[in-house]
Interface confidence: low
């Protein structure tokens, strides 16, 4: 009940708080508890104890282990185990899942990741941090205090972070990394009847026989999460699927989330080699969600060829 | 013929990893929202994870958040679960699902087993 | 999340016999709600869509209803192939989630 995991990187330094409680006046000693050897309490050694931490400046992977810390007052003895664990330095930029702390989840309102086990610590600021081993560049990111903020907060900043500080003791400087995961939760979204920013309803494209075409179907449908929400394009009441044309083939554009919030589709038709036959269909853009289903039409005219003005 | 097979499951201790795959055959996979959805011995259906089709959007089950990754190669028709700390509760039969456009899972794989245990 | 409550939990029933099951959604889910059949061992499979429409190549003894929090699935003459599991689920918003499943027992 009264043990805690703790780990770090070879050549860093860690510092474990005694998993008991006790008042500052109380002593605490600290024990290897395979051989029930005492921790030194002289900061000349690499591994000591001081009151309720112990430390590490810097670790070894042979420290790994169990370490007993009994807190001593008057009345009563708690005893308090710290499950140790130095793993060696890894040479790529992955982050094991044993190394990474408590997940946390952020949104556009509220973005901060707090940088773990830095209390333990005597650092001064500014923080370093990284995302997927890329050092945090630009305005939108700022290290504050032990945390950093992100604004204007989006999916894709959700990975792994690191943040990195120096730790001093008696002059020295030893340095400490620590990662998160962070990931980005959506404010209240909202679900509408989609709304087709493209094509117009009873759009005329003009296009030029023998070349591609290209027509895009756009559609938004609320903001935040849209579970099911999709555009495509029909021709002459068919899926395109089913129409058996390979000249003529869908393909998904990006998700798109506008300024304003919105989630938007998009589903570009590709014509290639458009033909005289091409002309005689009804284009269809689909955009349905929850709510129901909007259509838009759209028909293919003949371009004048010797007006490239237009 | 319209088909989803799974693979990779089996027998892996708590807090260990293990990556599902699921190989789409015989329809348009690059434009189709997949999921997968998991069903414990003895229990009923519990939806995990969602996927839109270009695999920009993705979305999770409250009980997997942060463990559970998914994503999908549509030049291989395939879609993955990548599952990270697993827990005892995470055993179960994991199905891979295509999404049609009304919500309903309407292609299913025939399961792959995951177990986790010490 | 949407809650999807099923009963019975299960029923015993002789083949020929009109089966209705209920399923009931913790709020309003319009019409999203499905229907699917699984066998022991067997990955479960899409009967009805939308509440009422019937997946193609489905048998149409099976058949589906409602809209709103209450539905039914009738199965109108139980056949020997029809004694499974049944589950009812939501596709009105995330998570998608299902009911509990109704087991179909031969009596």
């Known amino acids: 009940k009264f043990s805690k995991q703790s780990w770090g990187l070879e050549n860093e330094a860690l510092i474990v708080r005694c998993p008991r409680q006790g008042k500052p006046s109380y002593t605490v000693d600290w024990y290897y508890s395979q051989t029930n050897k005492s921790i030194p309490t002289q900061e000349r050694n690499r591994v000591f104890a001081s009151g309720q931490l112990l430390k590490f400046l810097p670790a070894a992977v042979a420290d790994s282990g169990i370490y007993t810390c009994i807190v001593r007052s008057p009345t009563f003895n708690r005893t308090g185990y710290a499950n140790v664990t130095i793993y060696k330095k890894q040479s790529d930029c992955n982050v094991p899942d044993y190394l990474m702390y408590s997940t946390v989840s952020g949104s556009e309102k509220n973005s901060k990741i707090y940088c773990p086990t830095i209390d333990l610590y005597n650092w001064t600021a500014p923080l370093e941090w990284f995302k997927n081993c890329q050092a945090l560049q630009g305005s939108r990111y700022r290290a504050h205090k032990s945390f950093l903020v992100i604004d204007n907060v989006m999916t894709e900043d959700a990975g792994d972070y690191t943040c990195k500080f120096i730790h001093n003791e008696n002059g020295a400087n030893y340095s400490v990394t620590a990662t998160r995961s962070f990931t980005v939760k959506d404010e209240q979204g909202f679900s509408l009847f989609p709304v087709i920013g493209a094509p117009a309803q009873n759009e005329i494209k003009e296009v030029e026989i023998g070349k591609n075409a290209n027509l895009t179907c756009s559609a938004c449908f609320g903001k935040g999460t849209q579970f099911l929400a999709a555009v495509l394009w029909q021709l002459n009441g068919t899926k395109i699927t089913d129409f058996g044309e390979p000249r003529i083939q869908q393909e998904e554009g990006q998700n798109q989330s506008f300024s304003n919030g919105l989630a938007c589709l998009d589903m570009v038709l590709r014509i290639a080699d458009v033909k005289e036959e091409d002309l005689l269909l009804q284009y269809d853009c689909l955009a349905l969600n929850l709510h129901g289903l909007r259509r838009h039409t759209v028909r293919l005219s003949r371009k004048n060829p010797i007006d490239h003005h237009s | 013929e319209v088909q989803l097979l799974e693979s990779g499951g089996g027998l892996v201790q708590p807090g260990g990893s293990l990556r599902l795959s699921c190989a789409a055959s015989?329809?348009?996979?690059?434009?189709?929202?997949m999921s997968w959805v998991r069903q414990a011995p003895g229990k009923g259906l519990e939806w995990v994870s969602a996927?839109?089709?270009?695999?920009?959007?993705?979305y999770y089950a409250d009980s997997v958040k942060g463990r559970f990754t998914i994503s999908r190669d549509n030049s291989k028709n395939t879609l993955y679960l990548q599952m990270n700390s697993l827990r005892a509760e995470d055993t179960a039969v994991y199905y891979c699902?295509?999404?049609?456009?009304?919500?309903?899972?309407?292609?299913w794989g025939q399961g792959t087993t995951v177990t986790v245990s010490s | 999340d949407i809650q999807m409550t099923q009963s019975p939990s299960s029923l015993s029933a002789s083949v020929g016999d009109r089966v209705t099951i209920t399923c009931r959604a913790s709020q309003s889910i319009s019409s999203y709600l499905n229907w699917y059949q699984q066998k022991p061992g067997k990955a479960p499979k899409l009967l009805i869509y939308?509440?009422?429409s019937l997946r193609s190549g489905v048998p149409s003894r099976f058949s589906g209803s409602g809209s709103g929090t209450d539905f039914t699935l009738t199965i109108s003459s139980l056949q020997p192939e029809d004694f499974a599991t049944y589950y009812c689920?939501?596709?009105?918003?995330?998570?998608?989630?299902f009911g509990q499943g109704t087991k179909v027992e031969i009596k």
């Open positions: 015989d329809f348009n996979f690059k434009n189709a929202w």
């Open positions: 939308d509440a009422s």
């Open positions: 689920q939501q596709s009105y918003s995330t998570p998608p989630t």
């Open positions: 699902a295509r999404v049609g456009e009304t919500g309903a899972f309407d292609i």
């Open positions: 996927i839109s089709g270009n695999g920009a959007g993705t």
